[in-house]
């Protein structure tokens, strides 16, 4: 192990230098380990499982946004192995608080039961 090598680097025995770990393609995540000077002989990249995605590199697969369950929004674009889901307008019975600052997830829809009078998404 070479402690001078970075998080995503291994010690190349041939050159004696730190070398970048091979990055994974979008839709894949690293399997086994590479970094801080060492690389498993069988290090590789495996596909993201269902409901997860990765932009590649050294990123692990992350779960798609749950538009309906968490955001109470419609699904504009379902996620795949390479892309997160994109959420659309609120589900029926929910409305968007436009003046709220976005949280780390983006906009969240709130129940019309909590809506101020005459909220357009909740009228009718």
């Amino acid at each position: 192990e070479d402690s001078n090598c970075g998080e995503n680097e291994y010690h190349n025995q041939t050159t004696g230098l730190c070398q970048q770990c091979p990055p994974c393609r979008p839709g894949e995540e690293p399997y086994m380990s590479c970094g801080y000077g060492t690389k498993d002989d069988d290090y590789g990249c495996v596909p993201c499982p269902a409901e997860k995605f990765s932009k590649g590199g050294y990123q692990i697969c992350r779960r798609h946004k749950d538009c309906e369950g968490f955001f109470r929004a419609t699904v504009l674009t379902p996620g795949d192995m390479e892309n997160d889901a994109e959420c659309g307008p609120c589900l029926p019975g929910y409305y968007m608080l436009e003046n709220r600052p976005r949280n780390i997830y983006g906009m969240v829809c709130y129940s019309c039961l909590l809506a101020p009078p005459n909220t357009k998404e909740c009228v009718g």
Partner: antibody, heavy 119, light 107 residues
Framework: EVPLEESGGGLVKPGGSRKLSCAAS????????MHWVRQAPEKGLEWVAY????????YYADTVKGRFTISRDNAKSTLFLQMTSLRSEDTAMYYC????????????WGAGTTVTVSS | DIQMTQSTSSLSASLGDRVTISCRAS??????LNWYQQRPDGTVKLLIY???RSQSGVPSRFSGSGSGTDYSLTISNLEQEDVATYFC?????????FGGGTKLEIK
Amino acid sequence: EVPLEESGGGLVKPGGSRKLSCAASGFTFSDYGMHWVRQAPEKGLEWVAYISSGSSAIYYADTVKGRFTISRDNAKSTLFLQMTSLRSEDTAMYYCARREILRYYFDVWGAGTTVTVSS
Amino acid sequence: DIQMTQSTSSLSASLGDRVTISCRASQDISNNLNWYQQRPDGTVKLLIYYTSRSQSGVPSRFSGSGSGTDYSLTISNLEQEDVATYFCHQGKTLPYTFGGGTKLEIK
């Protein structure tokens, strides 16, 4: 040019031994993990053994463990399968196959060599 | 070990047909599913890797899909040269295992 070429097959008596070879060309052999896969007559494919690029990781199917030995000579770009205590059920076409770099599948296959175990 | 099952051992279709070959794993293999074509002369070739990705040089009429335990290979416009046996393979866990194969013939 054929990237993988197996040799060493033939007729062997039960209990006998045989060494198969797989000559690689047209790519940097030492960069790739390699597998042996076999196919009994009129049957499906069966994974037999794997050796990583630097020989630090070696795995066998339970059906051949203790009887078969996979090895490689990176300087000669050659993969080997030493088979001992052969049984009739080892009769098959034996393929060597390359593991794609960073991936867990076989991206290039040889044409195969036939081993027949019979008295 | 993970068992791979190809429920159809042989099928016959006409030129130009759309053909789907299915494969089921005994447990979730997280899209680590590959498809191989074995021609009548014994030649084996990788078609699709990691469920849906085409190996370079493979005609676009071959496509793959699925997730979890259920996967399929589709040939959208059957040609004479597609006469072969098709095998699925899981690369998730050693020992690697294959389906029993589906032999495709032309009517």
